[in-house]
Interface confidence: low
């Protein structure tokens, strides 16, 4: 079943998706698509990363997080009612049928009032384990669920909105560390 996320018309929607690179520089291709995850790849691709970079994206769709550390959460700018629906985050782990697939449901609500331009909303999660991903940037704490038997750890967050992105950053940078792998 899909995890549901909400945003209002005119705001930015945020669909969280994370993985942990097995080693520095060991990035894994990721695709985001509109519609539930198919057997292979993503349908109606809106954004794609490869082993080094974001190599494809379409208007209004972008990664605000630090994708080099595995934060491949999707931001959709200035959403409309037409943006409602299922989105697929697919972590394309090498090997046959190894991909991690996550379906996230986006529900767009009509704006109560005409929205002033706002910053992106951030979300945080509540899982029982913590991981600090490693790169050469500041530590970013991400909350994790159960870990699969592979060197890549994937989560999608179950979250309430944090209205102030600074708060989300403070939570991410709070420094709890468990080394995995």
């Amino acid at each position: 079943s899909e995890v549901e996320y909400r945003a209002e018309v005119g705001q930015n929607a945020y669909l969280p998706c994370f993985y942990t690179p097995a080693a520095p520089g060991n990035l894994v291709p990721v695709c985001w698509g509109k519609g539930a995850c198919p057997v292979f790849e993503c349908g109606n691709v809106v954004l794609r990363t490869d082993e080094r970079d974001v190599n494809y994206w379409t208007s209004r769709y972008w990664l605000n997080g630090d994708f080099r550390k595995g934060d491949v959460s999707l931001t959709i700018e200035n959403v409309t009612l037409a943006d409602s629906g299922i989105y697929c985050c697919r972590i394309q782990i090498p090997g046959i049928m190894n991909d991690e697939k996550f379906n996230l449901k986006l529900v767009i609500k009509p704006a109560k009032v005409t929205p002033a331009p706002t910053r992106q909303r951030d979300f945080t999660a509540a899982f029982p384990r913590m991981l600090t991903t490693r790169g050469h940037g500041p530590a970013e704490t991400q909350t994790l669920g159960s870990l699969p038997d592979i060197n890549l750890t994937q989560i999608s967050t179950l979250a309430n909105e944090l209205r102030d992105s600074r708060l989300a950053n403070d939570l991410r940078d709070s420094g709890a560390t468990i080394r995995i792998g």
């Epitope: 520095p24 520089g25 990035l27 082993e51 080094r52 997080g65 630090d66 970013e140």
Partner: antibody, heavy 117, light 108 residues
Framework: QVQLQESGPGLVKPSETLSLTCTVS????????WNWIRQPPGKGLEWIGY???????NYNPSLKSRVTISVDTSKNQFSLKLSSVTAADTAVYYC???????????WGQGTTVTVSS | EIVLTQSPGTLSLSPGERATLSCRAS???????LAWYQQKPGQAPRLLIY???SRATGIPDRFSGSGSGTDFTLTISRLEPEDFAVYYC?????????FGGGTKVEIK
């Protein structure tokens, strides 16, 4: 093709703040890591810091207390501010793009900043 | 902080000769995050090698990189006149990002 261009005053007085801007053309700043590096006359390269397009920053600890790097995605620019400068901060200052796995693949041509009264 | 030590400081060679430049790290560097740059007088550095051994776009195949852990090497198989310059290694896998002190390859 992406190009980087540094701009800013070539002369700064001691104790003042050095301010430089790097303009990204031919591509979007809303990807990658954007670095500042400097090179004192006749010496090697020193990394100052970077800003990720999302706004997160990382600075060289030796300069951290004096450095601020910011990004203006609407202008496709990122900036360096270095406070309380001394003659030791005289250098050629470069901006460079760091794509992550590929390293710093695109550099500006550099701008010389002299700290002198 | 990872300290990168390059040797020799200066390498005096003739065109057509083979150049071998060394970069030694004070602690292990992920080979995914080790780069080599070339810098000519009055110019910005130019990326030659990333990931310790992969040539950047447009770099001639006479340039090659190798090594892992703490010892890395840049080899120029046959020096061309335009190859005489200063070469820097850099690690970008841990903070702070650091450069080696450079090796100057000069005409003998």
């Amino acid at each position: 093709q992406v190009q980087l261009q540094e701009s800013g005053p070539g002369l700064v007085k001691p104790s003042e703040t050095l301010s430089l801007t790097c303009t990204v053309s031919g591509g979007s700043i809303s990807r990658h890591y954007w670095n500042w590096i400097r090179q004192p006359p006749g010496k090697g390269l020193e990394w100052i810091g970077y800003i990720h397009y999302s706004g997160s920053t990382n600075y060289n600890p030796s300069l951290k207390s004096r450095v601020t790097i910011s990004v203006d995605t609407s202008k496709n620019q990122f900036s360096l501010k270095l406070s309380s400068v001394t003659a030791a901060d005289t250098a050629v200052y470069y901006c460079a793009r760091d794509t992550g796995y590929y390293g710093m693949d695109i550099w500006g041509q550099g701008t010389t900043v002299t700290v002198s009264s | 902080e990872i300290v990168l030590t390059q040797s020799p400081g200066t390498l005096s060679l003739s065109p057509g000769e083979r150049a071998t430049l060394s970069c030694r790290a004070s602690q292990s560097v992920s080979s995914s995050y080790l780069a080599w740059y070339q810098q000519k007088p009055g110019q910005a550095p130019r990326l030659l090698i990333y990931g310790a051994s992969s040539r950047a776009t447009g770099i001639p195949d006479r340039f090659s990189g190798s090594g892992s852990g703490t010892d890395f090497t840049l080899t120029i198989s046959r020096l061309e006149p335009e190859d005489f310059a200063v070469y820097y290694c850099q690690q970008y896998g841990s903070s702070p990002l650091t450069f080696g002190g450079g090796t100057k390859v000069e005409i003998k």
